[in-house]
């Protein structure tokens, strides 16, 4: 396994309607035609895998069904966007890349990305 | 230029197994997935899986779960789709499809699963 | 699953006509994609990433939408474009197909 350099930024607010997209980029030594993206988040020291795609050669990134994230690729960037956030979910979100195929299997790890999420204030009432 | 040829037809009765080819050329085999659709007839498209030629890494559709199993050949630039246990519900015409975005189709397998 | 449902199943139009056909899926994805198919051939990728036309394809088609609604037009028809149209998604696994809509002439 080698080790290979991944970058995210450091925070991301996400919006009034719980979405939250940042990009990931990785250092690839080779050409890969086989490239898995997995989403962590580590909160509490807990780390935990949100969601996780594997693509070949094309821009969409495709998930498992129910899955909160949606991505596209080009070149050696990621576009992750998570969805369905609420305040409780706050937390260091880190961008996993593993370069699977041709080998040598590559590995890296970005610092995170700390997502903020905000619940909306519900409405006032009105008299209006 | 790209071609995919598939396997001939096949009859095959109830319970039985039928096992597709689709030989890839004119491409590097393990740069694009391998899918592979189904068409039963008068009837729309239907996914079946997928497979990453150079890994193996597969995903297929729940639909199909313990029925359906792909494999591939580097050596001879093949993939295999194998169905067992068939029914008369799975007569149709499998298909191969190459990337993600099915840019190129193989000519269709017709399996027909009759008793 | 998310499911696509394109609208109509079934459309009579002449040569000329512009004509649109819609994609709604049950749940938002990044792009949908469409694909042509003749009588006894395999499909053929028209459009993808929703609004990119494939190699080779007459500028007469056209994609648009986002989120949950996507269309495709032909804006007018000719004669070898009388066929069967299918959406597809793959935002998430399994990937999936629309219904297909019949292109008739009138």
């Known amino acids: 396994c080698k080790a290979m350099h991944v970058a995210q930024p450091a925070v991301v607010l996400a919006s009034s309607r719980g979405i939250a997209s940042f990009v990931c980029e990785y250092a690839s030594p080779g050409k890969a035609t086989e490239v898995r993206v997995t989403v962590l988040r580590q909160a509490d020291s807990q780390v935990t895998e949100v969601c996780a795609a594997t693509y070949m050669m094309g821009n969409e990134l495709t998930f498992l069904d129910d899955s909160i994230c949606t991505g596209t690729s080009s070149g050696n960037q990621v576009n992750l966007t998570i969805q369905g956030l609420r305040a409780m979910d706050t937390g260091l979100y880190i961008c996993k890349v593993e370069l699977m195929y041709p080998p040598p299997y590559y590995l890296g790890i970005g610092n995170g990305t700390q997502i903020y999420v905000i619940d909306p204030e519900p409405c006032p009432d009105s008299d209006f | 230029q790209v071609q995919l040829v598939q396997s001939g037809a096949e009859v095959k009765k109830p319970g039985a197994s039928v096992k597709v080819s689709c030989k890839a050329s004119?491409?590097?085999?393990?740069?694009?997935?391998i899918n592979w659709v189904r068409q039963a007839p008068g009837q729309g498209l239907e996914w079946m899986g997928r497979?990453?030629?150079?890994?193996?890494?597969?995903y297929y559709n729940e639909m199909f779960t313990g029925r359906v199993t792909l494999t591939r050949d580097t050596s001879t630039s093949t993939a295999y789709i194998e169905l067992s246990s068939l029914r008369s519900e799975d007569t149709a015409v499998y298909f191969c499809?190459?990337?993600?975005?099915?840019?190129?189709w193989g000519q269709g397998t017709m399996v027909t699963v009759s008793s | 699953d998310i499911q696509l449902t394109q609208s109509p199943s079934f459309l009579s139009a002449s040569v000329g006509d512009r004509v649109t056909i819609t994609c709604s899926a049950s749940k938002s994805v990044s792009y949908i994609h469409w694909y042509q198919q003749k009588p006894g051939k395999a499909p053929k990728l028209l459009i993808y990433?929703?609004?990119t036309l494939a190699s080779g394809v007459p500028s007469r088609f056209s994609g648009s939408g986002s989120g949950t609604e996507f269309t495709l037009t032909i804006s007018s028809l000719q004669p070898e474009d009388f066929a069967t149209y299918y959406c597809q998604q793959r935002t998430t696994y399994p990937l999936t197909f629309g219904q297909g809509t019949k292109l008739e002439i009138k």
């Open positions: 004119g491409y590097t085999f393990t740069s694009y997935w």
């Open positions: 990433d929703t609004s």
């Open positions: 499809a190459i990337g993600d975005y099915f840019d190129y």
């Open positions: 497979i990453a030629p150079g890994s193996g890494t597969t």
